[in-house]
Structure formats: structure tokens, C-alpha cells
Amino acid sequence: KIDTPQRGSIQDINHRVWVLQDQTLIAVPRKDRMSPVTIALISCRHVETLEKDRGNPIYLGLNGLNLCLMCAKVGDQPTLQLKEKDIMDLYNQPEPVKSFLFYHSQSGRNSTFESVAFPGWFIAVSSEGGCPLILTQELGKANTTDFGLTMLF
């Protein structure tokens, strides 16, 4: 088993990259002198206890920043949040920590990230741009849920 996180960069189909701004991830057009975040990702070690055929369950963090993406309900609405967390602490837990897990599915060059805690909710960015990453159930409408993930070796 791979037991160190892999690193990657992400952009959406409009070539916007993820940037950390005031502890919030936003998607912005790539420009010079900009620092897109590097993603840290690691597969859940308890994959056999999760749903099959939904994608590879992964923990998603920001490389070197001890921040991980998680899903939590605010009122009745699942929301995407950044939490201070060591991705390896999540990886080593005795059970899947579902609020921090995403099913990563790949179709060609496109990747989607579906919340394990809230099935049917996907990481998305508004088509507007310059907006925070969100969770959405609305696929292919006002929000983009397809991303390009490039692994860095």
C-alpha cells in the first residue's frame, strides 16, 4: 500500500486553478506570479469497507499546510470546508473518516470528487470564477464539477 500522500495540481476545464485566500479555496484564472495550491491526496486504507464502483475514496489536503477538505452540514446544506488536519492522521484512523473522504472518479482527463459523507454532492466551482469551491448536486449547470488532476512526481 502507498502510505505517503501523492502530490498533484488541479485546474478546471476553464483553466482556473485553486488558490488559498483567507483559509478559503477559490478558483481563479492562472496568472503570472500566482501560487496555486498543490494538492496532497491519499487513498483510504479501508477501501473494502466503502462503496464499490463510485470511484477511489481519497483524503484531499493542501500539501505542506496541514489543511484538509471536509464536508459538513450547515443547517440542512452540505458545505465544503477546510479544516486544520494532518492528512496522515486521517489515513491512519481505524475507520474511514467519511466527512473528509471523496470518491475520485476519472473519465479520460476529467476527475470528479464526490463527498462520501453526502453521496450525490460534488466539489464544484461556479462558472463565474473567482468564487470559493463549493459542494453541489447540480451537475453540468451553473457549476463545474469536472477537474483536471495532474500528478506531480
Epitope: T49, L50, D89, N92, Q93, P94, V97, K98, S99
Partner: antibody, heavy 121, light 110 residues
């Protein structure tokens, strides 16, 4: 208030099967893992296994694999423990317990009141 | 499969500190065993105290603390109270299953 309410005591004959129940209230059962634990007099606790109620996947202690079956009915927030081919060794108190992630770790934080199973002819 | 061993009984007095331990037959207990401590009071009343070796469960008094001491997991009650008289069980995680100890009966002489 978080509660795990277990079904009543059972007296069954050797070779029979039995199904014990654990009904959750005060929390969303799909957000946790529900475990079953066996307690015999003067013998401590034995972990039987667990279920993820959201998905239905299970894990068992090798000793109980094939003997115990854990299932869930999310419509009634209930988890069941089924035992087959009962023997006197299965006479014990059985507990359900919630394993819940809070802060940075998992905790066996809430427990049912226990169900006494007596296997006797 | 590992066997998890605890002291069968300990006695303390109100206000004193007492430490209960949890040993694994398969070697040193580490943070990877995610030691949990559970309290059983009369009439089958169980409550979780500690998770992840040293994290207190919500609502658990600060006098309860978890740690590793040498090659064992430990539960320390600093300033024991009469209501702490109970049986205390540890549970250790081993890759894909939990193993509970036999329990320690703690008597608080009051």
C-alpha cells in the same frame, strides 16, 4: 439526547438462531459506526464486529465470522445482530455501541443497556 | 490474535491519583492502536472516556487522562472521586479488528 435502545432478554434453545436489535435515537445513525460487543461473567468484553449503517459494510472478529451477522435497517435507525447455531457458549450480555469520530479521533462513546441472551434446553 | 491484559483490580482513596494500564501480547502498545477507555458502572451502564490514546470524549471530566507509559496504554484518574468506582475496559485496534481487555475493577475507598 443520544440513545441506543436494545431489545429485551432472550431465552433460546441450543441450535436455534436469534436476532437482537439496537435502535438509535438523537443522532443520525448513518454518521457513525455501530459495534456489537459480548460480555460473559468474569470474562471481560469481546468485540464481535461492526456495521457502517450508511453503506451496510461490515467487519467481524475472525472468531465470530460465520457465526454472527450484523445488518441495518436505516428506515427505522435499527441495527441487528443475528446469531446462528447457538450453544451455551453464546450465553452472555450483548451490547451495541456507537463508534463516533469527534475532533481528531474515534470514541466508543455511547452504549446500549445490553441484551441478555440465555441458551438453554 | 493479540490478548489485551489489564490489572484485575485496583484500590484508591478519594483525592488520590491512580493509573490503570493496558498491555498487548503482540508487543508495545503505540498510538497506532488508538487505545479507547470505557467505564462500566452497575446495571450495565457504559460510557466512553478516552479515544485515540489520549483524547477525552466530550463531557468527560478533566481528571481522566489517557497516555502511553512504557509499552502500555494507561488511564490516569487524578483526584479520584467515589463516583469513579467502576470497571474500566481498554480497547486496542489491530489493523482490522478491536480487542478489549478483561477490565479493571476500581474501588474508591470512601
Amino acid at each position: 439526547e443520544v440513545q441506543l435502545q436494545q431489545s429485551g432478554a432472550e431465552l433460546v434453545k441450543p441450535g436455534a438462531s436469534v436476532r437482537l436489535s439496537c435502535t438509535a435515537s438523537g443522532f443520525n445513525i448513518k454518521d457513525t459506526y455501530i459495534h456489537w460487543v459480548k460480555q460473559r461473567p468474569e470474562q471481560g468484553l469481546e468485540w464481535i464486529g461492526r456495521i457502517d449503517p450508511a453503506i451496510g459494510t461490515t467487519r467481524y472478529d475472525p472468531k465470530f465470522q460465520g457465526k454472527a451477522t450484523i445488518t441495518t435497517d436505516t428506515s427505522s435507525d435499527t441495527v441487528h445482530l443475528q446469531f446462528s447455531s447457538l450453544t451455551s457458549e453464546d450465553t452472555a450480555v450483548y451490547y451495541c455501541a456507537r463508534l463516533h469520530y469527534f475532533g481528531n479521533n474515534f470514541f466508543f462513546d455511547y452504549w446500549g443497556q445490553g441484551t441478555t441472551l440465555t441458551v438453554s434446553s | 490474535q493479540a490478548v489485551v491484559t489489564q490489572e484485575s483490580a485496583l484500590t484508591t482513596s478519594p483525592g488520590e491519583a491512580v493509573t490503570l494500564t493496558c498491555r498487548s501480547s503482540s508487543g508495545a502498545v503505540t498510538t497506532s492502536n488508538y487505545a479507547n477507555w470505557v467505564q462500566e458502572k452497575p446495571d450495565h451502564l457504559f460510557a466512553g472516556l478516552i479515544g485515540g490514546t489520549n483524547d477525552r470524549a466530550p463531557g468527560v471530566p478533566a481528571r481522566f487522562s489517557g497516555s502511553l507509559i512504557g509499552d502500555k496504554a494507561a488511564l490516569t484518574i487524578t483526584g479520584a472521586q467515589t463516583e469513579d468506582e467502576a470497571i474500566y475496559f481498554c480497547a486496542l485496534w489491530f489493523s482490522n479488528h478491536w480487542v478489549f481487555g478483561g477490565g479493571t475493577k476500581l474501588t474508591v475507598l470512601g
